[in-house]
Interface confidence: low
């Protein structure tokens, strides 16, 4: 999906709003420092096609966060304020239905939300900035 | 207004090295990349690299990669690029220019440095 | 890396005429581009972003369009301040990288 048609200060003020308080809850006892950001982004459309692939994308060890409340929450927000991105995620979505929940927040898990909440801080800052 | 102020001109002899500076004003400085951009005489613009002066972080060309160093100094809002073992075809304008989106809204007057025996 | 070509390299036009400028990319870079004007002994100017986003302060005579791998820069009416040289620019990813340039001299 081509994130450059989104409406970038609406997304801002969602993650700000709701996103970011659940990716904190979800790695609460767990210490930014813990993990090295190995995954960057260099522009805002950028950031945002990183965002969507830790979050909806299975890896390996982390089977699937896309279930997770900030995730639910990640996707209505780009469905909302990106154009045409919900009908490119119908196939996705249908696919992700036949995978288990996760039922247990791996290390690894928790690795792939502290590089999501490093990928969101570099797709907010500007906001952030100003306030 | 935003504004991109570079070092002056350089005249240096092969081997040398030389630091050029970018002072920026006008806006948040960590809130932008600040990127370094090669014009040779007569010839087009070619991306050395780009720093993130909220953390420092780097990305280089790899052309550019043991040839250009780039830091920040977020006290005065400065970016420098430092050229090591000058060359003659290191001769050319240096421009900074910052980013938010990956393309380059202000760009500083440019800075000639010239490698010469 | 993406490897960005301009066509032409120059052209000679009239004021009032109207002005095409091409850039191709070696891959599909969806609508992440960017056109510059430099004239001579001047930083380069942004003209356009994200393929048709016209950059403010910038008259409505220039357009871009595009997406994917084929892109163009169009000038609807050459004006005398106009004649410059026009660089392309991916902003996909890094490395960032430009086109060649294309000159536009007066006729």
């Known amino acids: 999906y081509d994130f450059t048609n989104c409406d970038f200060q609406k997304i801002e003020a969602d993650y700000l709003r709701t996103i970011s308080k659940d990716l904190i809850t979800y790695m609460s006892g767990t210490k930014s420092t813990d993990f090295n950001n190995t995954v960057s982004c260099s522009n805002r459309p950028h950031c945002l096609t990183e965002i969507q692939s830790l979050t909806f994308n299975p890896t390996p060890r982390c089977a699937s966060l896309a279930k997770e409340m900030f995730a639910r929450k990640t996707k209505a927000t780009l469905a909302l304020w990106c154009p045409g991105y919900s009908e490119t995620q119908i196939n996705a979505t249908q696919a992700m239905k036949k995978r288990r929940k996760r039922k247990v927040t791996t290390n690894k898990c928790l690795e792939q939300v502290s590089q999501l909440l490093g990928l969101w801080r570099r797709f907010i800052r500007t906001l952030l900035k100003k306030q | 207004q935003v504004q991109l102020v570079q070092s002056g001109a350089e005249v240096k002899k092969p081997g040398a090295s030389v630091k050029v500076s970018c002072k920026a004003s006008?806006?948040?400085?960590?809130?932008?990349?600040m990127h370094w951009v090669k014009q040779a005489p007569g010839q087009g613009l070619e991306w050395i690299g780009v720093?993130?002066?909220?953390?420092?972080?780097?990305t280089y060309n790899q052309r550019f990669k043991g040839k250009a160093t780039l830091t920040v100094d977020t006290s005065t809002s400065t970016a420098y690029m430092e050229l090591s073992s000058l060359r003659s075809e290191d001769t050319a304008v240096y421009y900074c220019?910052?980013?938010?989106?990956?393309?380059?809204?202000?760009w500083g007057q440019g800075t000639l440095v010239t490698v010469s025996s | 890396d993406i490897q960005m070509t301009q066509s032409p390299s120059s052209l000679s036009a009239s004021v009032g005429d109207r002005v095409t400028i091409t850039c191709r990319a070696s891959?599909?870079?969806?609508?992440?581009l960017a056109w510059y004007q430099q004239k001579p002994g001047k930083s380069p100017k942004l003209l356009v972003y994200?393929?048709?986003t016209l950059a403010a302060g910038v008259p409505s005579r220039f357009s871009g369009s595009g997406s994917g791998t084929d892109f163009t820069l169009t000038i609807s009416s050459l004006q005398p301040e106009d004649f410059a040289t026009y660089y392309c620019?991916?902003?996909?990813?890094?490395?960032?990288?430009f086109g060649q340039g294309t000159k536009v001299e007066i006729k």
């Open positions: 220019t910052r980013s938010l989106d990956g393309f380059f809204d202000y």
């Open positions: 006008g806006y948040t400085f960590t809130s932008y990349w």
């Open positions: 720093i993130d002066p909220y953390d420092a972080d780097t």
């Open positions: 891959e599909n870079i969806y609508s992440y």
């Open positions: 994200f393929a048709k």
């Open positions: 620019q991916h902003h996909y990813d890094t490395p960032w990288t």
